[in-house]
C-alpha cells in the first residue's frame, strides 16, 4: 500500500491525483514534437530543443530550470569525405563500395542534417586486408576462433554481427585479437523478426538500414578527456593519445544488403556450428579471406571521421521539497538522438515531459513533494553517457550526501509485450506495490493489475508468483549514479517477448527509420504502453519523493546477496584443486551475508515500530536507508575500472549492457585456467573475496542501531 504525504494541501493531492493527470494524448503530442528533425548531440538543433524544454518545464511550474553545459569530446563523419568500405581487386581497383547513407523514410526525403551511419569515435584509417567473420565478436567467439579453430585475427579486418553485447565490447575484443579494422553489420537473424514487414510497412529493418552507435570503452569515465572531473570552462584536458576508452582501429557499420556482398565471397574455415550462422543466403565461412576465384580480392576501409571538443547542454529542472529539500529524487533521461529518435530517446523524453507537467499541475494547486525532485534532460548519452556523467561529476559532493534515488527514463518502449524493470533490490518492494495498483494495458488483462500481466508474461526464475526484475548493467544514464556514486537506481520500459523474438534490441534501433510513425503505426497507436510506463516511472518518483519512510526494503538486498554469493562460489568450485592448493575460502563472504541478513531483519522490525512523529528519528532511519546503497561503494573502484565502484554490481567486462554480481570476484575467476601465473591469479581471487566480504559486512553495520 502506498504511503503518500499531502504537504500543505487537501487530501486529494496524492499519488492518484498525480497518476490521473498523466494523459496518453499528451505523450503522443510531445513525441511528435520531439521527432520532426534530428537532435544529434552537439548540434544547433539539439541546443534549440534544450531551450524549448527549459521553457516548457518552467511553464509547467517547476521552481527553476537551468541549462548545464559542458565541452566534451564528440565524433562526427567528415561531410566532404564520406566513410565507406570497398572490395578491391589485385590492382587496387574498388569493385564494390558500401552505401554512403540510408535511403530516407517516406516523408523525410528533404530533411537536412541526417548524419550518415558511422561508428562514433572510430579513428581515421584506410586499412586493407583479408576478412575474418567473428560472429558476434563476443569473448567466447574469439575463444572459439583462436583456441578451437586456431584462426589468428592478427592483421585482419574482422566483420561482426551486431547483437548480444555492447558494440564497444566487440571492438575491444577485436583489438585484443590483433585485428586492424572492424566492420559491424545487422544480420536479419537478429534484426528481422519473422512474419513482419520491413519499414515503412512494418517495424523490421530494411536491407539498407544501419545501426549507428559509439564504440567507446569508457568504463564509466564520462568525457574521454576529463575523467573524474567536469568538462567545464577551466578543465584540464588530456591529449588525445591519453584519452579514455577510444578505439585504436577503424570501425564502420553497414546494413545487411552490403554485408551480403562481403560475406558471400568468404572462404577459409566453415562456421564452427549453427550458432555462427545468421539468416543471409551466404555460407558464413569464417575465412580468413575470400574463396577460390576471389582469393586475390581484399577488403578496404575508408574512415575519415573526426573527434571534436563540442558544447553539450543538459536541462535540469527543480521541484523543491517542502519537508526535506536537501534530499533529492532524480528523474532523468536523454534528449540527444542519432537521427529522429522515435524510440530512443524521445519515447522516454515525451514521458518525462508529461510527468513534469503532472507534477507541475499539482504544484500549481499548492502541493509540494516532501523531498526535492530533480528532472534532467541529458545530452550526449549516445556518445558515452556524457551529459549525465559530467553533471554528476560536477555535483558529486551534493549527490553523495543528498541523493535518495535516480530513476532513468530513456526509451519507454522496445516492444509492446510486457513490462521490463531493472533496479536495485532496495526498490523491489516499491515496484511490486506500485504495479499492483496500476491497471494493465495488455490485451486479455482488462481489469487486471499491471503486476498480474507482468508476472504472467515475465515470471521470476526464482520466486513463483513474482515478476522478473533484472540487475542494472550500464549503457544508459543511470550508470554514474548507481555504479560510481551508489545512489539507488531503477529503470522501467515496455519490452518484447524475449521467448519468441530472439532479435537483439528492436530492429530499427539507431537507424534513420526510428521515426514518430514507427511508434504511432506499429508499436503503440493508442500510446497506452507509453502511459503505463509514465505511471510506473512517475509513480516511483512520487513515492520516493513523498513517502514519509523511504520505500526501500533492505531485506531484499539480503536475499540477493545470498543468491550472488552462492553463484560465485559455484563458479569457483569448478576449480576444486586450485581452491585447495591456494587455500581459497568463501567463509568470510558467507559469514558477512549471514550478518547482513540478520541485521537487515532487525532493522526492518525497528522500521515498523519507531516513532514516525519524531523528525530526528525519522530522518535517522531514512538516512540509514538512503546510505545503504552508498555503503556498497568501494572508493578504490574495481581493478582497472576506477569509476565502477559498486562492489555488488558492475557492468559485465564482456558486455556493458549486462549487470554482473560480485564483479570483482567474477572477473578474477573468469578464464582463470588461461592465466599463466596461477598463484598470482588465485591470489587476486582471494583479495576480491576479502573486498566483497568486508564491504557486505561494512554495509550491514550501517543498518545496526546507531548507539
Amino acid at each position: 500500500k502506498s504511503s503518500n504525504e499531502a504537504t500543505n494541501i487537501t487530501p486529494k493531492h496524492n499519488m492518484k491525483a498525480f497518476l490521473d493527470e498523466l494523459k496518453a494524448e499528451n505523450i503522443k503530442k510531445f513525441l511528435y514534437n520531439f521527432t520532426q528533425i534530428p537532435h544529434l548531440a552537439g548540434t544547433e538543433q539539439n541546443f534549440q530543443l534544450a531551450k524549448q524544454i527549459q521553457s516548457q518545464w518552467k511553464e509547467f511550474g517547476l521552481d527553476s530550470v537551468e541549462l548545464a553545459h559542458y565541452d566534451v569530446l564528440l565524433s562526427y563523419p567528415n561531410k566532404t569525405h564520406p566513410n565507406y568500405i570497398s572490395i578491391i581487386n589485385e590492382d587496387g581497383n574498388e569493385i564494390f563500395n558500401t552505401s554512403l547513407f540510408e535511403p530516407p523514410p517516406p516523408g523525410y526525403e528533404n530533411v537536412s542534417d541526417i548524419v550518415p551511419p558511422f561508428s562514433a569515435f572510430s579513428p581515421q584509417g584506410m586499412p586493407e586486408g583479408d576478412l575474418v567473420y567473428v560472429n558476434y565478436a563476443r569473448t567466447e567467439d574469439f575463444f572459439k576462433l583462436e583456441r578451437d579453430m586456431k584462426i589468428n585475427c592478427s592483421g585482419k579486418i574482422v566483420i561482426a554481427r551486431y547483437g548480444k553485447v555492447f558494440r564497444g565490447n566487440k571492438v575491444k575484443n577485436a583489438q585484443l585479437a590483433g585485428a586492424k579494422g572492424v566492420i559491424l553489420y545487422s544480420d536479419p537473424a537478429d534484426y528481422f523478426a519473422p512474419g513482419v514487414k520491413s519499414y515503412p510497412d512494418g517495424w523490421n529493418l530494411p536491407g539498407g538500414g544501419v545501426q549507428r552507435g559509439n564504440i567507446l570503452n569508457l568504463n564509466g569515465a564520462g568525457d574521454p578527456l576529463t575523467p573524474g572531473y567536469p568538462a567545464n570552462e577551466y578543465a584540464y584536458r588530456r591529449g588525445i593519445a591519453e584519452a579514455v576508452g577510444l578505439p585504436s582501429i577503424p570501425v564502420h557499420p553497414i546494413g545487411y544488403y552490403d554485408a551480403q556482398k562481403l560475406l558471400e565471397k568468404m572462404g577459409g574455415s566453415a562456421p564452427p556450428d549453427s550458432s555462427w550462422r545468421g539468416s543471409l543466403k551466404v555460407p558464413y565461412n569464417v575465412g580468413p579471406g575470400f574463396t577460390g576465384n576471389f582469393s586475390t580480392q581484399k577488403v578496404k576501409m575508408h574512415i575519415h571521421s573526426t573527434n571534436e571538443v563540442t558544447r553539450i547542454y543538459n536541462v535540469i529542472g527543480t521541484l523543491r521539497g517542502a519537508v526535506e529539500p536537501d534530499r533529492y529524487v532524480i528523474l532523468g533521461g536523454h534528449r540527444d538522438s542519432w537521427v529522429f529518435g522515435g524510440i530512443d530517446p524521445q519515447s522516454g523524453a515525451a514521458v518525462v515531459h508529461e510527468i513534469v507537467r503532472s507534477f507541475g499541475t499539482l504544484k500549481k494547486e499548492g502541493w509540494r513533494p516532501r523531498r526535492t525532485i530533480l528532472f534532467a534532460s541529458w545530452d550526449a548519452e549516445e556518445f558515452g553517457l556524457l551529459g549525465s556523467t559530467e553533471w554528476a561529476e560536477e555535483n558529486s559532493r551534493l549527490l553523495q550526501e543528498r541523493g535518495v534515488a535516480y530513476i532513468n527514463a530513456d526509451s519507454s518502449i522496445e516492444g509492446n509485450y510486457t513490462l521490463r524493470v531493472d533496479c536495485t533490490p532496495l526498490m523491489y518492494s516499491l515496484v511490486h506495490n506500485l504495479t499492483k495498483e496500476l491497471k494493465s494495458p495488455d490485451e486479455g488483462f482488462e481489469g487486471k493489475s499491471l503486476y498480474e500481466s507482468w508476472t504472467k508474461k515475465s515470471p521470476s526464475p526464482e520466486f513463483s508468483g513474482m515478476p522478473r526484475i533484472s540487475k542494472l548493467g550500464s549503457g544508459n544514464d543511470f550508470e554514474v549514479f548507481f555504479q560510481r556514486l551508489g545512489i539507488a537506481s531503477g529503470r522501467a520500459r515496455y519490452t518484447k517477448n524475449w521467448e519468441t523474438n530472439k532479435f537483439s534490441g528492436y530492429p530499427l534501433y539507431h537507424s534513420v527509420y526510428e521515426t514518430y510513425e514507427l511508434v504511432e503505426k506499429f508499436y503503440d497507436p493508442m500510446f497506452k504502453y507509453h502511459l503505463t510506463v509514465a505511471q510506473v516511472r512517475g509513480g516511483m518518483v512520487f513515492e520516493l519523493a513523498n513517502s514519509i519512510v523511504l520505500p526501500f526494503d533492505c531485506r531484499d538486498y539480503a536475499v540477493v546477496l545470498r543468491k550472488y554469493a552462492d553463484k560465485i562460489y559455484s563458479i569457483s568450485m569448478k576449480h576444486p584443486q586450485e581452491m585447495k592448493t591456494y587455500s581459497v575460502s568463501f567463509d568470510s563472504l558467507f559469514s558477512a551475508v549471514k550478518n547482513f541478513t540478520e541485521i537487515a531483519s532487525k532493522f526492518s522490525e525497528r522500521l515498523q515500530d519507531f516513532d514516525k512523529s519524531n523528525p530526528i528519528v525519522l530522518r535517522m532511519m531514512n538516512d540509514q536507508l538512503m546510505f545503504l546503497e552508498r555503503a556498497f561503494i568501494d572508493p578504490l573502484g574495481l581493478p582497472d575500472r576506477p569509476f565502477y565502484r559498486h562492489v555488488i554490481y558492475a557492468p559485465s567486462s564482456h558486455n556493458k549492457y549486462a549487470g554482473e554480481s560480485f564483479p570483482g570476484i567474477y572477473d578474477a575467476l573468469f578464464d582463470i585456467e588461461s592465466k599463466v601465473d596461477p598463484s598470482k591469479a588465485w591470489g587476486e581471487v582471494k583479495r576480491q573475496i576479502y573486498v566483497a566480504a568486508f564491504t557486505v559486512q561494512a554495509a550491514a553495520e550501517t543498518l545496526s542501531e546507531v548507539a
Epitope: K150, H575, K675, V676
Partner: antibody
Amino acid sequence: EVQLVESGGALVQTGGSLRLSCVASGFTFSNYWMSWVRQSPGKGLQWVASIKKDGSDEDYVDSVKGRFTISRDNAENSLYLQMTSLRIEDTAVYYCARFISAVGVDWGQGALVTVSS
Amino acid sequence: DIQMTQSPSSLSASVGDSVTITCRASQSINNYLNWYQQKPGKAPKLLIYTASSLLSGVPSRFSGSGSGTDFTLTISGLHPEDFATYFCQQSFSTPPITFGQGTRLDIK
C-alpha cells in the same frame, strides 16, 4: 602443490613402441590443455604434442605425426603418449607439461626414452 | 612456423655481473615471448611470460623486455644459483610451440 609425475621411460629398439604416462595433482586437470615436450641429450627443447581439456583436439609436431598419439583420462588425472615406429632421433627426455595459453607453466621431472638400433 | 634464434649460445660471467640474453623471432610475435631456466638433470622452469611479466616467486633481478621480433632477458647482479641454461619460447602462433636453441650461462 602442482605435481606432474611421468613414468614409462625405457630403452627400446628402433621401430618399437612405448607408452608414457603422466599423473597430475594439485590442479583441476580437466580444465587444462596438456602437452609433451622432449629434450635430446645436450640439445634444446622441442614441443611434441598437445591435447585439449576434453581430449577432443590434438596437435603434433610434424616429425611425429602418424607415429605418436596423445590422450588423456580426466577421471584419472592422467596424460599419455603412445609412441610407435620409434626412431633413433626420438631419443630424449620426455616432459609432461601443463601449458597455459601456450606457456609451459608446470613440468614433470621427465622420463628418459632411449631408442637404439 | 615461427623460428626462434637465441644469442649468444653460451656466455661466461661472474657472480654480481649483469648479463643480457637476446632472442629474435622470424616474424612479429607481439609480446608473446616466454623465458625459461633449466639446470642440469632438471625440468625447465618458467621465469617470465608475455615478454616482461615476472612469474610469482621469481626474483626481481630477472627482467624481460621487447616486442615484435626482438626480445631480451636481463639478469641484474648474478647469484650463484643463476648459472644455468636459458630458453626463449614463442606462444603467439601455435601449433607448433617453438623454443630458442638455448643459452648456457657459465661461471667465469
